[in-house]
Amino acid sequence: SEVEYRAEVGQNAYLPCFYTPAAPGNLVPVCWGKGACPVFECGNVVLRTDERDVNYWTSRYWLNGDFRKGDVSLTIENVTLADSGIYCCRIQIPGIMNDEKFNLKLVIKPAKVTPAPTRQRDFTAAFPRMLTTRGHGPAETQTLGSLPDINLTQISTLANELRDSRLANDLRDSGATIRIG
């Protein structure tokens, strides 16, 4: 089952995915696709990295974190209802059938209709990325009680949601993110 993340129409959605490179700069190819992870690689690819850089991306999809340190979380700009669905993050660890794959469910909610002051709109136009809003998972994915029901691989996608809490540090220290090498 997929871990669920939420965002409102017009916001930027955030889908977390991590791995720990074996050594600095020793990167692993990663792909993101719209749709569940297929047998290998990603279906309906929206973004790819190789051993050095991002080598393919489509409009509105980008990596906001430091992918050279293994933060390959996907940001989707200015989401619409059509962006709802399953997304695949696949970390293509070298070897035979060695990939780590994560299916993340993005739920887009209609925007709340609240009139914004003119000055706020001007600020948004001038600094659009400063107002990035990250989608959050359902409350139960952020409680200790639900963690035993979540795969270890899924925990790595939760770590970013929890990174400001002590639980995030506990997860990382216990190796919940993918370590390579």
Epitope: F40, I93, G95
Partner: antibody
């Protein structure tokens, strides 16, 4: 124009080895996953193996795992299939195929090379 | 592994008729990850449809795919002489990649 040309097939005894090659042209070889698919005489298609563009990731069907090895040389635009411990049931036409940009399905195929395993 | 069962095994039709080929999966195929191929005697397969309904480059619009979950259909709206061949479905949603056993479309 995309072209895939297989070679290396032939008659081999059970337990023997064979190495198939597939010369590719007409596309940026290193950008695409590649696969081997086989077809026993008069039978349907069976996926055998796949390899990522860089060669770092490989996948195998259970029926060949541990016996077959897929590899590629991007400098030569060539795909390989090393087949060891061959069995009678490995007798088939072996097709080299290029995966689509979104891999897992095959948009160009070679004409195939026949491998016959018999004593 | 997902087993794909194609029916009928053989379809006998005349040029100009409509052909409907079925592919049923033993379990749900995620994200409609299903492709269709055509194979003529002595030739390599040719990709027709991927993602259950997207036509591959250069494929005439008389070929169409539909379906989701466990039931998929390839329709040839009006058979041309060159369409008589064997058709295979293939799923790529669950490891390993698997093909159906094929449906032969023959001239009646």
């Amino acid at each position: 124009e995309v072209q895939l040309l297989e070679s290396g097939g032939g008659l081999v005894q059970p337990g023997g080895s064979l190495r198939l090659s597939c010369a590719a042209s007409g596309f940026t070889f290193s950008n695409y996953w590649m696969s081997w698919v086989r077809q026993a005489p008069g039978k349907g298609l069976e996926w055998v193996s796949a390899i990522s563009g860089s060669g770092g990731s490989t996948y195998y069907a259970d029926s060949v795992k541990g016996r077959f090895t897929i590899s590629r040389d991007n400098s030569k635009n060539t795909l390989y299939l090393q087949m060891n411990s061959l069995r009678a049931e490995d007798t088939a036409v072996y097709y080299c195929a290029k995966d689509h940009w979104d891999p897992n399905f095959l948009d160009y195929w070679g004409q195939g090379t026949l491998v016959t395993v018999s004593s | 592994e997902i087993v794909l069962t194609q029916s009928p095994g053989t379809l006998s039709l005349s040029p100009g008729e409509r052909a409907t080929l079925s592919c049923r999966a033993s379990q749900s195929v995620s994200s409609s990850y299903l492709a269709w191929y055509q194979q003529k005697p002595g030739q390599a397969p040719r990709l027709l449809i991927y993602g259950a309904s997207s036509r591959a480059t250069g494929i005439p619009d008389r070929f169409s795919g539909s379906g989701s979950g466990t039931d998929f259909t390839l329709t040839i709206s009006r058979l041309e002489p060159e369409d008589f061949a064997v058709y295979y479905c293939q799923q790529y949603g669950s490891s390993p990649l698997t093909f159906g056993q094929g449906t032969k479309v023959e001239i009646k």
